[in-house]
Amino acid sequence: MAVTACQGLGFVVSLIGIAGIIAATCMDQWSTQDLYNNPVTAVFNYQGLWRSCVRESSGFTECRGYFTLLGLPAMLQAVRALMIVGIVLGAIGLLVSIFALKCIRIGSMEDSAKANMTLTSGIMFIVSGLCAIAGVSVFANMLVTNFWMSTANMYTGMGGMVQTVQTRYTFGAALFVGWVAGGLTLIGGVMMCIACRGLAPEETNYKAVSYHASGHSVAYKPGGFKASTGFGSNTKNKKIYDGGARTEDEVQSYPSKHDYV
């Protein structure tokens, strides 16, 4: 029972995590314009892995995709790759773990096969979570580096008279979604690996012992006890908190003047 609960919980946590990784990857707010200590602009810039957006105070939002592969920074390409690998591994892990769930009966699948599948999916979730955390962390590091570089020359003087304000970017909501989602996927993967230990049948072969009593003989053949692990004994006290980050990807397409009419 505890094994089933641990496996089920691991699956659900991983599912939430992978959904979060997908959401983070698709979100436009990986980096957002830093408003602190900056002149207040009537334009707000934010960027994602796939496109950059500008929201005017008018409410109009324009998003432009990065329609180049070669022109993009290597770091951005690496982050994209890490996030995609994380999603692919997570999706395969979910598929495998569905069939591995103890509560689901598929033909006459052995417990050992389910245990192997649970372990496989667990490892996939762990790697998926690590990919997401790594991707988000690389991007965050890139932002921090650029932030301090742009702070060093925040105002690039032009002839000493005219000033150009450099737009600085800070952490966007997607980074936090990514970190939380990666962490959840990692936790889910660990739970699956723990559940795998409980699923694996431990063959304990005792030699058959014959007891000869007067009048009749009884043979006891104790065999193949399934070792019960103590995991999940206090699961009812565990609370799983989901960050519940909402993605507001409300990209308003440019209205024509007729939108007023």
Partner: antibody
Framework: EVQLQQSGPELEKPGASVKISCKAS????????MNWVRQRNGKSLEWIGN????????NYNQKFKGKATLTVDKSSSTAYMQLKSLTSEDSAVYFC???????????WGQGTLVTVSA | DIVMTQSPSSLTVTAGEKVTMSCKSS????????????LTWYQQKPGQPPKLLIY???TRESGVPDRFTGTGSGTDFTLTISSVQAEDLAVYYC?????????FGAGTQLELK
């Protein structure tokens, strides 16, 4: 057709307050920010501030903070600007205008002349 | 606040003539996010509210004759009227739409000779 109908001219005494209205029609009122602009004796234009009719959020020109208060009534699609502690310096034509691409102002009210005189 | 400097303050022209007026801002109005300049040009005739001519420094508003052209980037902007018509006689204002508070230039008065 988009229309911004402003209230009529106002003659006020110094120290008094005045509330100018701007009734919008022909478009979704809550979809676009409403801006207010002042023009003194036919000279240049001064941006007072703007209000998001949907959330009620405002941005003010520091110069007009404490002088102008922007509000909206969504039910009647009307924007209001209240000017308090009027002085002769506040005598001007006040325009309301809706925002467009590039934060530009596309549709303007006809203007409300406020005269402050003892 | 961003200072918008328009020059000349007035222009006396003859019909059919080409006219250029300048607008300079104290800070760059170019947004790096979309490479657009947040500068707007308006035309105001006596007793009327201003009329939007050009936004994003060079995008002509629909219905505005193509004799009106906006150019420039960063801090230096120009409005050109290729062939002035009698109905173009008005005051022309440029506006900073990038930094709060949104500020206007003092205007360029276009008069007929």
């Amino acid at each position: 057709e988009v229309q911004l109908q402003q209230s009529g001219p106002e003659l006020e005494k110094p120290g008094a307050s005045v509330k100018i209205s701007c009734k919008a029609s022909g478009y979704s009122f809550t979809a676009y920010n409403m801006n207010w602009v002042r023009q003194r004796n036919g000279k240049s234009l001064e941006w007072i501030g703007n209000i998001d009719p949907y959330y009620g959020g405002t941005n003010y020109n520091q110069k007009f903070k404490g002088k102008a208060t922007l509000t909206v009534d969504k039910s009647s699609s009307t924007a209001y600007m209240q000017l308090k502690s009027l002085t002769s310096e506040d005598s001007a034509v006040y325009f309301c205008a809706t925002v467009y691409y590039g934060n530009s102002l596309i549709y303007w009210g006809q203007g409300t002349l406020v005269t402050v005189s003892a | 606040d961003i200072v918008m400097t328009q020059s000349p303050s007035s222009l006396t022209v003859t019909a059919g003539e080409k006219v250029t007026m300048s607008c300079k801002s104290s800070q760059s109005l170019l947004n790096s996010g979309n490479q657009k300049n947040y500068l707007t040009w308006y035309q105001q005739k006596p007793g009327q509210p201003p009329k939007l001519l050009i936004y994003w420094a060079s995008t002509r508003e629909s219905g505005v004759p193509d004799r009106f052209t906006g150019t420039g980037s960063g801090t230096d902007f120009t409005l050109t009227i290729s062939s002035v018509q009698a109905e173009d006689l008005a005051v022309y204002y440029c506006q900073n739409n990038y930094f709060y508070p949104l500020t206007f230039g003092a205007g360029t008065q276009l008069e007929l000779k």
